[in-house]
Amino acid sequence: EVQLVESGGGLVKPGGSLRLSCAASGLTFERAWMNWVRQAPGKGLEWVGRIKRKTDGETTDYAAPVKGRFSISRDDSKNTLYLQMNSLKTEDTAVYYCAGSNRAFDIWGQGTMVTVSS
Amino acid sequence: DIVMTQSPDSLAVSLGERATINCKSSQSVLYAGNNRNYLAWYQQKPGQPPKLLINQASTRASGVPDRFSGSGSGTEFTLIISSLQAEDVAIYYCQQYYTPPLAFGGGTKLEIK
C-alpha cells in the first residue's frame, strides 16, 4: 500500500525549532518530487516548499513566508523526507502534510500538528 | 479484462481488391459519456514499429490513405482496405483503449494473392 506517514509535530515556543519527518512506503521514493503543504486551523492549504529528485539536482524551493527559516531535505536510502523548521512563529501553527509526486500531489500523508505558542 | 479477438488470422487478397478484417471485443468499448468507441487499428510491417491507422473506430490518422476505413460500434469492428496496394502487406492489429489493461487483438496477416 502506498503511504506517507508524518511525525515530529508538537508544541514549541516562538523562536524554537522542530524537525518533521515523512516516511514513505509502497512508492519509488527516489523518483518523486516531495512537498510540504500546511493548513492553519480552519484555514485553507498553503504550499510550503519542495525538494526535487536527485536526478533533477535535489534542488529545493520555498514559499516566501518560510524562506530562510525552513529547510527541506531527503534521505532516499531511508525513503524519508524532512522539514527542519527554525525561528518558529505563532503563524506557523498548522497541520503539516507531506505530499509526493511530480506536479499534482497524488499521494498525501495524514498530517502532523505543529503548535507554536508561548 | 477486455479480450480482443481478430479474424481471420491471415488472408490473401489480390491487388486492387477489398480486404476486410474483423475485430470483436469481449465487452463494449463504447463510452456513453461522449458516444465514442475507444478502438484503434494499427499496421505493422516487418522490422518496424506499429503505425496508427484508425482511432475511435472510424477516424483516420493523419496521413493515412483514404482506402483505409474503419467501422463498427460497441463490440464489433471492421477494418476495410478498399483497393489493396502492394505496400499494404503487413500485420494489422486492433486495440481497445477504453480501460486498462489496454489490449490488442492477436493480429491479422495480410498478403497479396
Epitope: A32, W47, S101, N102, A104 | N55, Q95, Y98
Partner: antibody, heavy 121, light 111 residues
Framework: QIQLVQSGPELKKPGETVKISCKAS????????MNWVRQAPGKGLKWMGW????????THADDFKGRFAFSLETSARTAFLEINSLQNEDTATYFC??????????????WGAGTTVTVSS | DIVLTQSPASLAVSLGQRATISCKAS??????????MDWYQQKPGQPPKLLIY???NLESGIPARFSGSGSGTDFTLNIHPVEEEDAATYYC?????????FGGGTKLEIK
C-alpha cells in the same frame, strides 16, 4: 519533429537487469502518457502498462508487475523501462508509445522504433 | 506570486444537481500547451485528495461525475450529479510557477 528515440539493442544473461530509455522530442512531454508494449519474436503486441508523465504514477498490466519498473527523467523528456531478474522469455522487442492521460487512455499515435532485448546464457 | 481566486466561497446544491466551482488565476498557468491546474477535495480531518490534474484529466479511481475544464486563467470544476459524499471543501492549485499556490477553497454542502 515529433518522435520517440529508444536506446539500442541489449544482450543480457538470465538474472541480469536491463534499462531501456525512450527520449521524446517535438511535443510537450508532460501532456502525454508513455506506454510500453512488448512483442516477442514472431508474436503479437502486448501492452505492459504506462506512466503518467505529469504525476509520475506508473500503472502495470498484471503480467508485468514485480520485475518491471517504469520511471521518468522529466527534465530530459525521457521515459525508462527497467526489467530485473531477466528470464529467457523476456527476449522481445520493447516499444514505447505515446498515449493519453485522462479518464480514457487514448490511442498510441507515436511509437519508438523498438529496443530488442535478447536474454541468453 | 500567482493568486488563485475561487468562487463561490461556499455553495449548497441539491442531490442529483450540478455543482460548479470557479477558479481564476491572476496570470496564465499555461505552459507549452498544457494547463498546470489541479483540483483537490478535502473532507474534515482528512488530507486533500487529488481529483483532476492538468485542468481536465480525471485522476485514477475518481468517479466520472467530476470534470475539470478551462485554460489560461479561467478554470472550472463541475460535479454532476452531486452525491451525498461530495460534501467537502474543494481547492484549485497551480504548479506552473513558483511558489505553487492554492485557491482559498470552496465549501460544498448538500441541500
Amino acid at each position: 519533429q515529433i518522435q520517440l528515440v529508444q536506446s539500442g539493442p541489449e544482450l543480457k544473461k538470465p538474472g541480469e537487469t536491463v534499462k531501456i530509455s525512450c527520449k521524446a522530442s517535438g511535443f510537450t512531454f508532460t501532456n502525454y502518457g508513455m506506454n510500453w508494449v512488448r512483442q516477442a519474436p514472431g508474436k503479437g503486441l502486448k501492452w505492459m502498462g504506462w506512466i503518467n508523465t505529469y504525476t509520475g504514477q506508473p500503472t502495470h498490466a498484471d503480467d508485468f508487475k514485480g520485475r518491471f519498473a517504469f520511471s521518468l527523467e522529466t527534465s530530459a523528456r525521457t521515459a525508462f523501462l527497467e526489467i530485473n531478474s531477466l528470464q529467457n522469455e523476456d527476449t522481445a522487442t520493447y516499444f514505447c508509445a505515446r498515449g493519453g492521460m485522462g479518464v480514457r487512455l487514448r490511442y498510441f499515435d507515436v511509437w519508438g522504433a523498438g529496443t530488442t532485448v535478447t536474454v541468453s546464457s | 506570486d500567482i493568486v488563485l481566486t475561487q468562487s463561490p466561497a461556499s455553495l449548497a446544491v441539491s442531490l442529483g444537481q450540478r455543482a460548479t466551482i470557479s477558479c481564476k488565476a491572476s496570470q496564465s498557468v499555461d505552459y507549452d500547451g498544457d494547463s498546470y491546474m489541479d483540483w483537490y477535495q478535502q473532507k474534515p480531518g482528512q488530507p486533500p485528495k487529488l481529483l483532476i490534474y492538468a485542468a481536465s484529466n480525471l485522476e485514477s479511481g475518481i468517479p466520472a461525475r467530476f470534470s475539470g475544464s478551462g485554460s489560461g486563467t479561467d478554470f472550472t470544476l463541475n460535479i454532476h450529479p452531486v452525491e451525498e459524499e461530495d460534501a467537502a471543501t474543494y481547492y484549485c492549485h497551480q504548479t506552473n510557477e513558483d511558489p505553487w499556490t492554492f485557491g482559498g477553497g470552496t465549501k460544498l454542502e448538500i441541500k
